[in-house]
């Protein structure tokens, strides 16, 4: 008679995570007497999946009734498949022995691959804000997918980006994989309303990619521009000087007025005007009693934006009976001290 053969008809089976996997196995003979076992992997480190003779295997059910007379079908079904179940499964016939059964013949193996969806991509931006014309990095991460093949794209406001680097880990065999990508984005002044999108395509997503987004508003700081002007006043002994703070982002802004280097008033911006591009404007004014000053007065508008080093603009108010409406303004960076160098009138 022909010697028993162990037939595993499928070389490979692919199953989505959560489903059941059926692994088929048939014998060509009832002889020799002895149990069959299923193993994952081969060689010394193999893992017992099912033993016909003994043991408790809650996730494994046999497709046929193994105790049925003349049964040659030893197929099994494994429920609730996870990526950790991936591997090659061997159906193995043992010959009855004493004290232990002896492996007699093995099937050629069926490779079980598990299709697992990637997790929703998480996009994170830089820890510190940057100003326009600077480059910032965004990272995108997704985990738990299988098989390894995956496509990742970056977009900024719908336009595909090319400056990015992507890694899929681990490099070798694994039950599931992770992807990590870093994109470099050059900021522009109009990026307060901009968005970066990380898009992931995988076989398990059936052409409907996953997207993760980040707002550039979290990454950008647009520094303000200052303009100090004198407004006409009816009363000759008063001067109204305004400081127009324009096109800044984010909101956080503190303004200090100095008269000849001495702090006159400090205020925090509250009622802001929002521009179409998402930046803000704000105006502050200072009423100066010219009677209180014998000499010309240098008025300085000093602005600290988003915790950065203060910027300031000065205006020289000339105290003169005939020159109340003219002056010259001076812009400079103020150091940490609230005082600023005085500018001459021009």
């Amino acid at each position: 008679e022909d010697e028993l053969q162990v037939i595993q008809p499928e070389k490979s089976v692919s199953v989505a995570a959560g489903e059941s996997a059926t692994l088929r196995c048939a014998m060509t003979s009832l002889i020799p007497v002895g149990p069959i076992m299923w193993f994952r992997g081969a060689g010394a480190g193999r893992e017992l999946i099912y033993n016909q003779k003994e043991g408790h295997f809650p996730r494994v059910t046999t497709v046929s009734e193994l105790t049925k007379r003349n049964n040659l079908d030893f197929s099994i079904s494994i429920s609730n498949i996870t990526p950790a179940d991936a591997g090659t499964y061997y159906c193995v016939k043992f010959r009855k022995g004493s004290p232990d059964d002896v492996e007699f013949k093995s099937g050629a193996g069926t490779e079980l691959s598990v299709r697992a969806k990637p997790s929703a991509p998480v996009v994170s931006g830089p820890a510190v804000r940057a100003t326009p014309e600077h480059t910032v990095s965004f990272t995108c991460e997704s985990h738990g997918f299988s098989p390894r093949d995956i496509t990742l794209k970056w977009f900024k406001n719908g336009n595909e980006l090319s400056d990015f680097q992507t890694n899929v880990d681990p490099a070798g065999d694994s039950v599931s994989y992770s992807i990590h990508s870093t994109a470099r984005v050059v900021l522009t002044r109009g990026d307060v309303h901009s968005q970066v999108i990380c898009e992931i395509a995988h076989i398990t997503l059936q052409g409907d990619p996953l997207r993760g987004t980040a707002n550039l508003s979290e990454a950008i700081r647009v520094p303000p521009t200052l303009e100090v002007t004198q407004q006409p006043m009816r009363a000759e002994n008063q001067a109204n000087v305004t400081c127009q703070v324009s096109n800044f982002y984010p909101r956080g802004l503190q303004l200090t007025w100095l008269e000849n280097g001495n702090v006159s008033r400090t205020e925090t911006a509250s009622t802001l005007i929002e521009n179409k591009d998402g930046t803000y404007n704000w105006m502050s004014w200072l009423l100066v009693n010219t009677c209180a000053h014998r000499d010309d007065v240098v008025l300085t508008c000093q602005v600290e934006h988003d915790g950065q080093q203060a910027v300031s603009k000065s205006y020289a108010l000339e105290i003169s009976a005939h020159q109340k409406e003219h002056g010259s303004d001076i812009t400079h960076e103020a150091a940490l001290a609230p005082t600023a160098p005085l500018g001459g009138s021009g």
Partner: antibody
């Protein structure tokens, strides 16, 4: 570049417990088997046992009753405990990484520690 | 347990000449997936063993191509096409088909 470093006492009293730790640096414990192998002075290599990253253990039946191999993935370490030691357990003890691929099985012990000498003596 | 037997016990070699070591197993190391579960290792004096060949005939990363493994079932051979001075040490075969993993007794290669 993965490196393995054995640590533990060089001298153990007879009947006491031998405890060794292997620290894995420069790589992950995942997807590998982690083995202990010993070599008595002037003799050949003897496999003690190994542990898979998921915690499954395999032991040499001749030592099984005395040996425990455990894994601490958070510390990137695995350990060997051998109870009731005798002079016959005097050896250089190696920890090693065994590659494994699904469908193939073990395909080579590719990274070895430099070995640590353990002497069992009173 | 699978018993591994190596021969010769000692092998004096001349640099530049070929050398061959035999390893026999007490049962077949060829599995149904077509792989032979046999590895070869070299332990140089005072060093840890180093993987040379895995699964019967696959050269490990960084191993010079003068080393080759052959054989199937129960009979295996490690060949060195041209021995170099750095090849001195003890060569071991090891089976990885079943636990316990078992090693051959070793073949000591030394320069004549």
């Amino acid at each position: 570049q993965v490196q393995l470093q054995e640590s533990g006492p060089g001298l153990v009293r007879p009947s006491e417990t031998l405890s060794l730790t292997c620290t894995v640096s420069g790589g992950s414990i995942r997807n590998y088997y982690w083995s202990w192998i010993r070599q008595p002075p002037g003799k050949g290599l003897e496999w003690i046992g190994f542990i898979y990253y998921n915690g499954r253990t395999f032991y040499n039946s001749s030592l099984k009753s005395r040996v425990t191999i455990s894994l601490d993935m958070s510390m990137n370490q695995f350990s060997l405990k051998m109870t009731s030691v005798t002079a016959a357990d005097t050896a250089v003890y190696y920890c090693a990484r065994v590659r494994a691929y699904s469908g193939i099985g073990l395909d080579g012990t590719d990274v070895w520690g430099q070995g640590t000498t353990v002497t069992v003596s009173s | 347990d699978i018993v591994m037997t190596q021969s010769p016990l000692s092998l004096p070699v001349t640099p530049g000449e070929p050398a061959s070591i035999s390893c026999k197993s007490s049962q077949s190391l060829l599995y149904s997936n077509g792989y032979n579960y046999l590895d070869w290792y070299l332990q140089r004096p005072g060093q840890s063993p180093q993987l040379l060949i895995y699964l019967g005939s696959n050269r490990a990363s960084g191993v010079p191509d003068r080393f080759s493994g052959s054989g199937s079932g129960t009979d295996f051979t490690l060949k060195i096409s041209r021995v170099e001075a750095e090849d001195v040490g003890v060569f071991y075969c090891m089976q990885a088909l079943q636990t316990p993993l078992t090693f051959g007794g070793g073949t000591k290669v030394e320069i004549k």
